[in-house]
Amino acid sequence: LRPSRVHNSEENTMRALTLKDILNGTFSYKTFFPNWISGQEYLHQSADNNIVLYNIETGQSYTILSNRTMKSVNASNYGLSPDRQFVYLESDYSKLWRYSYTATYYIYDLSNGEFVRGNELPRPIQYLCWSPVGSKLAYVYQNNIYLKQRPGDPPFQITFNGRENKIFNGIPDWVYEEEMLATKYALWWSPNGKFLAYAEFNDTDIPVIAYSYYGDEQYPRTINIPYPKAGAKNPVVRIFIIDTTYPAYVGPQEVPVPAMIASSDYYFSWLTWVTDERVCLQWLKRVQNVSVLSICDFREDWQTWDCPKTQEHIEESRTGWAGGFFVSTPVFSYDAISYYKIFSDKDGYKHIHYIKDTVENAIQITSGKWEAINIFRVTQDSLFYSSNEFEEYPGRRNIYRISIGSYPPSKKCVTCHLRKERCQYYTASFSDYAKYYALVCYGPGIPISTLHDGRTDQEIKILEENKELENALKNIQLPKEEIKKLEVDEITLWYKMILPPQFDRSKKYPLLIQVYGGPCSQSVRSVFAVNWISYLASKEGMVIALVDGRGTAFQGDKLLYAVYRKLGVYEVEDQITAVRKFIEMGFIDEKRIAIWGWSYGGYVSSLALASGTGLFKCGIAVAPVSSWEYYASVYTERFMGLPTKDDNLEHYKNSTVMARAEYFRNVDYLLIHGTADDNVHFQNSAQIAKALVNAQVDFQAMWYSDQNHGLSGLSTNHLYTHMTHFLKQCFSLSD
């Protein structure tokens, strides 16, 4: 729980947060996610880096891998084979993009306590995983896929056409990694390890983004990434499946694409194995309002995969794009043909549906003016999911269980009343057959992770309660936080306000708006955080507000799809509307209002500053998008359509930051970007700067050499220190 407020007699011993506290991560919290290996066992890395096996039923634990072994190869990660014979140890981690990295892998034999010698794995490896049963290995090296029947065996090469920046096998290219799969891998074992499915991405015709990486050499390096911007040529994707028992027998077999998808540009969106001989693929038209789920079966006689039209399920949106941020994935039931899936109901709220034959005949499982967010697990008799139903707060997450074995199905909230004040935002992790599960509570109080019985929901033990953090916060004057809503013109604007510790409604405070505002995002969440804005409220006496306007998620399609094909309009309007309402509350100094945001938030903050309202004195944009023509095709076109004359080029042109250069004249603007941003290219800020210079508008700027979209490491400290100075100067606060 948040430490309770102390009375004046003790207030002298309390101190405000400092910027140093934030930059040092003094008040960071821990979570505990068990690495499940069976219904009742999990692995966990202990504080002293031993890998320990816990048996919930016996209460016993023992070390299966010592820290000495881990240290011998500088391992930072591990993975136990399902037959418990081997562990892979991962070292030499080298980050690539958001999810991808390369590493060196060593295989340790637990039976004899030695590393496997002979036929060692090549280095560096792009992805490696065990089969779901036994100890087969699949890995990707130099964009090709390899298979080992046993760790000590020589590898079998599955693909041969892999080429850097051209053909990717078993791993996604840049745009599929960031905007479609959200993983570092693009290969999937069948449940018993008989088959291996994989994607091949052909980037041959994709235009390349090139930027300088300055490094320490005499000449900078040029980084080249095939990166399709809006309207550009996209990757060509194909899905193959190979029999891993006899991989050389027939080789990889291509899975056919549904005809209605293949007729124009399309994407592959996900693959879900149902059984060893049934697989479900999801495809999406390039214009992302039509998605097709295709269930395919293995034909033993032909050794091919058959995807009958009768097993194609179409999901279409008439008011926006298909799905939320991504199209949801199915969770199959035990009959291996019917499944549960989240999609919009007739009232425009995302809910769980049960599909047995056709989508038209789907049975709606949840309903109401709230949204189902994730299906965690389906067992023979229960379905576990999360939603924001409880007490009508869209920024909460509770875990529910629906009994599907009985009729009518009964619903129980597993988490709603557990630690009601402390915990309102949960996720969960389930063991095999949901015999046990871990709950991870993210707030609003201090996070806590607990272990529960999957049948009774009884709490078995606390896995992590962040006692040290609780003690460390005892003498800190934390800001107050409140989550409320504004009703404006039939739109509900939820906001979070962070108030200085000694907040007094009769006084006037500077206001900082923190904005993200991207489609299907949510900023107003009941989670714990001690971060930069906590410091600004605690030490510098600012009021900070976050507002979820049109385009944001989990409040129905009307709000979500309001921004369809017109990004940069309503998101900005709603921030401005909220600021006006905050001023009406009487405690905001209207001469000291600022806005800041990062990425999409940098775009919104820039447009808000250039809105000509006179509301904002100053603002900051970190790594902003400045024109949707500069951003990735998969993301941009989902919400904006194509930048062509016969589609939506006009709004692409109207929604740029550059077009509003003149309007920055009356605000103080700080523009910040990393020069090695692979995601929102430095080009975006370069163009803003050019437009401001051409308009003879003064502004401040900071670049971070060789830094990507995250501005990590020492850059983080410099960034927040720099932004703090800028805001304090803007608000006339003494340094």
Partner: nanobody, 116 residues
């Protein structure tokens, strides 16, 4: 620390059967998953079969369909039923937790010899 005692080994002809037993000095149900391992002369120790406390079983490819592992919790015993034995099954057989504990010790094992 639970002490483990293997028994039931012996000399058997190719195609024959043996049943190995492993008795735990502590309560076996208080131990998680149990496994059988073997070490042939000149080779490294390798895993043969495993059974979880819930009764789920798993086998090495080399013994799949020929060996079966089962447990009798009240008797604190884990068994390995070995059928259709082959000369290449000749080894010292050990039982231990599955996977074995880094800091645990191995028992004496029981010798299985399969003659052709």
């Amino acid at each position: 620390q639970v002490q483990l005692q293997e028994s039931g080994g012996g000399l058997v002809q190719s195609g024959g059967s043996l049943r190995l037993s492993c008795v735990a000095s502590g309560s076996i149900s208080s131990i998680n998953a149990m496994g059988w391992y073997r070490q042939a002369p000149g080779n490294k120790r390798e895993w043969v079969a495993g059974i979880t406390s819930g009764g789920s079983t798993n086998y090495a490819d080399a013994v799949l369909g020929r060996f079966s592992i089962f447990r009798d919790n009240p008797k604190n015993t884990v068994y390995l039923q070995m059928n259709s034995l082959k000369p290449e099954d000749t080894a010292v057989y050990y039982c231990n937790t599955w996977p074995p504990s880094t800091f645990g010790s191995w028992g004496q094992g029981t010798q299985v010899t399969v003659s052709s």
